[in-house]
Amino acid sequence: MAVTACQGLGFVVSLIGIAGIIAATCMDQWSTQDLYNNPVTAVFNYQGLWRSCVRESSGFTECRGYFTLLGLPAMLQAVRALMIVGIVLGAIGLLVSIFALKCIRIGSMEDSAKANMTLTSGIMFIVSGLCAIAGVSVFANMLVTNFWMSTANMYTGMGGMVQTVQTRYTFGAALFVGWVAGGLTLIGGVMMCIACRGLAPEETNYKAVSYHASGHSVAYKPGGFKASTGFGSNTKNKKIYDGGARTEDEVQSYPSKHDYV
């Protein structure tokens, strides 16, 4: 039961995380105009990965896409790439994890296959989360660098007569969404990996083979050398955690690690 819960929770957390990564990637507020020196600005600038926007006091908002690829900073391109890779990996991870869910039955898929799929999706979620966190962090670092550079030459002009205020940008809402979403995807991935350990069979198990001795019959189960394997205590080989609801004859053939905890 705990495996299913861990896997299910991991899936849900990752799903929320990936939705957040997609939202962050699409958001326009990656960087917003710093209002420290002018809190009552009549023109407010903010920028995303794909376009920059200007919101006026009048309520008029104008957004312009970055219609060039080559003219964009390499760092911005890198952030875009990281976020897209994160989304793609996350989406594939979600697809894989749907089929890996213990509560979903697909044909006669064995636990080992589900375990492998769970591990694969978990790793994908971890990498996806890391990509998002890395992308957002690279952008944040870029902002910090530019912020202090623009602060250094905040006012430029002819003999101090004419002032040209350079627009400084600070962290936008998308950065926080991205960090949280990346973290959630990462946590979801870790949960999937933990769930995988519970799903994976210890070793290759074979059907119980009976050896008939002269006096009385003894059931011998190879490979069950752990003290906690339940040797001799569960001769019907029923699942312990679900109160013996399924027998060996049913779909679930292989006992998993978690069954004996």
């Epitope: 009552v40 009549a42 023109v43 926007c53 006091s57 009048s58 309520g59 004419v162 040209t164 205020v165």
Partner: antibody
Framework: DVKLVESGGGLVKPGGSLKLSCAAS????????MSWVRQTPEKRLEWVAT????????YYPDSVKGRFTISRDNAKNTLYLQMSSLKSEDTAMYYC???????????WGQGTSVTVSS | DILMTQSPSSLTVTAGEKVTMTCKSS????????????LTWYQQKPGQPPKLLIY???SRESGVPDRFTGSGSGTDFTLTISSVQAEDLAVYYC?????????FGAGTKLELK
């Protein structure tokens, strides 16, 4: 047709109060930022106050801050300017204006005259 | 506060003549986000409220004759009337729309010879 009609002006003593109103029609009032602009007897234009679309943000120049309050009643399509602690330098023609792109004021009312004198 | 300086304070012209008036701001009105200059030009005829002519320094308001042209960037702006008509006789004001407080120039009065 867009129409802005100001009212409430008049003669008031220094230190007195006055509330100006601006009835808007011919456009979706809730979708526009509105402002008050005054014109002194010397014909100088001075921005007095701005209220953003939702009414959550208001802006004033230092000369009127703390004395004037801009507000709007979206249900009545009306803009207000509550003026208190009036000074002789507040004597002017007060115009109600609508802001559009570029923060430009595309429509102005005919104005209401305010005279602060003892 | 951004100081707006208009020159000349008055202009005496003849009908059909080309007229240029200038407006200087103490601070740049160019917004880096959209590369637009937040300067507006208004025309005020006697006994009337001001009328919007040009916004974003060079964008003509709908219904404004094309003889009115706004130009300039940063801190220096001009309003040009290619061929002055009798109905153009008015006071022209420039305004900073970039940052609060919004400030107006003292105006340029256009008079007929």
């Amino acid at each position: 047709d867009v129409k802005l009609v100001e009212s409430g002006g008049g003669l008031v003593k220094p230190g007195g109060s006055l509330k100006l109103s601006c009835a808007a029609s011919g456009f979706t009032f809730t979708s526009y930022t509105m402002s008050w602009v005054r014109q002194t007897p010397e014909k100088r234009l001075e921005w007095v106050a701005t209220i953003i679309i939702g009414g959550s943000y208001t802006y004033y120049p230092d000369s009127v801050k703390g004395r004037f309050t801009i507000s709007r009643d979206n249900a009545k399509n009306t803009l207000y300017l509550q003026m208190s602690s009036l000074k002789s330098e507040d004597t002017a023609m007060y115009y109600c204006t609508r802001l559009v792109k570029g923060n430009a004021m595309d429509y102005w009312g005919q104005g209401t005259s305010v005279t602060v004198s003892s | 506060d951004i100081l707006m300086t208009q020159s000349p304070s008055s202009l005496t012209v003849t009908a059909g003549e080309k007229v240029t008036m200038t407006c200087k701001s103490s601070q740049s009105l160019l917004n880096s986000g959209n590369q637009k200059n937040y300067l507006t030009w208004y025309q005020q005829k006697p006994g009337q409220p001001p009328k919007l002519l040009i916004y974003w320094a060079s964008s003509r308001e709908s219904g404004v004759p094309d003889r009115f042209t706004g130009s300039g960037s940063g801190t220096d702006f001009t309003l040009t009337i290619s061929s002055v008509q009798a109905e153009d006789l008015a006071v022209y004001y420039c305004q900073n729309d970039y940052s609060y407080p919004f400030t107006f120039g003292a105006g340029t009065k256009l008079e007929l010879k």
